[in-house]
């Protein structure tokens, strides 16, 4: 009897109620491999989820998140609220990045500005809540006599721009 079931292809299940006949998966279910004794229920993309790919007899549905949310986890198992650039999501909602940190995406956490001096460089463009600092040539490269097309920006560590 087991051999009969192994002949059932993906998209079907081995129906014990019908003498091991391969029956098609019912609507809204699937079997991605052959020889299955049941079909799995299709995932439903509801609420904050929206359908990216419909279910078929051989593969599950795939979900995305509705506008204003983004996917987290394997196969978009959760949707997390988007924030604006320059913010991060906390338990109390979206909060502005603290001074000295930035976030250039709608998701994720605020990260510290790059410390240019650690690389022996100076700040070329100051950081903001939305953007990291841009490091320029090292102060030594800009000493009198060194060729430089642009004058050095006033060095402000770690990259503060007046708010």
């Amino acid at each position: 009897l087991q051999d009969l079931c192994s002949n059932c292809p993906a998209g079907t299940f081995c129906d014990n109620n019908r003498s091991q006949i391969c029956s098609p998966c019912p609507p809204n279910s699937f079997s991605s491999a052959g020889g299955q004794r049941t079909c799995d229920i299709c995932r439903q993309c509801k609420g904050v989820f929206k359908t990216r790919k419909e279910c078929s007899s051989t593969s599950n549905a795939e979900c995305d998140c509705i506008s204003g949310y983004h996917c987290l986890g394997a196969e978009c198992s959760m949707c997390e609220q988007d924030c604006k650039q320059g913010q991060e999501l906390t338990k109390k909602g979206c909060k502005d990045c603290c001074f000295g940190t930035f976030n250039d995406q709608k998701r994720g956490i605020c990260r510290p500005w790059t410390n240019c001096s650690l690389d022996g460089k100076s700040v070329l463009v100051n950081g903001t809540k939305e953007r990291d600092v841009v490091c320029g040539p090292s102060p030594a490269d800009l000493s009198p006599g060194a060729s430089s097309a642009t004058p050095p920006a006033p060095a402000r560590e770690p990259g503060h721009s007046p708010q």
Partner: antibody, heavy 114, light 111 residues
Framework: RSLEESGGRLVTPGTPLTLTCTAS????????MQWVRQAPGKGLEYIGT??????VYYASWARGRFTISRPSSTTVDLKMTSLTTEDTATYFC??????????WGPGTLVTVSS | DVVMTQTPASVSEPVGGTVTIKCQAS??????LSWYQQKPGQRPKLLIY???NLASGVPSRFSGSRSGTEFTLTISDLECADAATYYC?????????????FGGGTEVEFK
């Protein structure tokens, strides 16, 4: 269990027309339902699908002029506007192209002629 | 939209022979492909679903395979009843690209 299309007839260019697909013996809203057409002597041409969840997908050429809806649990409609002679074809509704047991209706003939 | 390019447009083989029909997808549609047989004046009949799975009641002389974006329908031990037009269809249904498209069809006749 069967599907049957209705509403096909002779119309003049520019006339709107709605075709209906009616299911017997099963609930249409449990399945993905697609509309396909076939001009005389030509191949099959995909129009669009309404999924079991109510999402609607169209071939890009059909978007805007064709509208698929599910007015009840046993019927699916295809609304067509701005018909031209190029739309003359047999129109089929079919159940679940992605499943192992699809079902097709016999088709309904739409003739667009002046 | 996904474009399905089907070759050849027609083929003529003797009874007992083998016919190979190919469908090339314009992008990676994974295994979302079905093969249909249609005879004049009739509705299409499913032969193969999910690229390689034989539909219920279809003889094992019909088989399907996939290599990347190319799909193949093989009909071996041809019988007179196999004279028909064969179509592939991309069965992907989702928002990231438009599936549903059919190949142009292959007419199988006998020498």
């Amino acid at each position: 269990r069967s599907l049957e299309e209705s509403g096909g007839r002779l119309v003049t260019p520019g006339t709107p027309l709605t075709l209906t697909c009616t299911a017997s013996g099963f609930t249409i809203s449990s399945y993905h339902m697609q509309w396909v057409r076939q001009a005389p002597g030509k191949g099959l041409e995909y129009i669009g699908t309404i999924s079991s969840g109510g999402n609607v997908y169209y071939a890009s050429w059909a978007r805007g002029r064709f509208t698929i809806s599910r007015p009840s649990s046993t019927t699916v409609d295809l609304k067509m506007t701005s018909l031209t002679t190029e739309d003359t074809a047999t129109y089929f509704c079919a159940r679940d192209s992605g499943y192992s047991d699809p079902m097709w209706g016999p088709g309904t003939l739409v003739t667009v002629s002046s | 939209d996904v474009v399905m390019t089907q070759t050849p447009a027609s083929v003529s083989e003797p009874v007992g022979g083998t016919v190979t029909i190919k469908c090339q997808a314009s992008q990676n549609i994974r295994t979302y492909l079905s093969w249909y047989q249609q005879k004049p004046g009739q509705r299409p009949k499913l032969l193969i679903y999910a690229a390689a799975n034989l539909a219920s009641g279809v003889p094992s002389r019909f088989s399907g395979s996939r290599s990347g974006t190319e799909f193949t329908l093989t009909i071996s031990d041809l019988e007179c009843a196999d004279a028909a037009t064969y179509y592939c269809q991309c069965t992907y249904l989702g928002t990231d690209y438009v599936g549903g498209a059919f190949g142009g069809g292959t007419e199988v006749e006998f020498k």
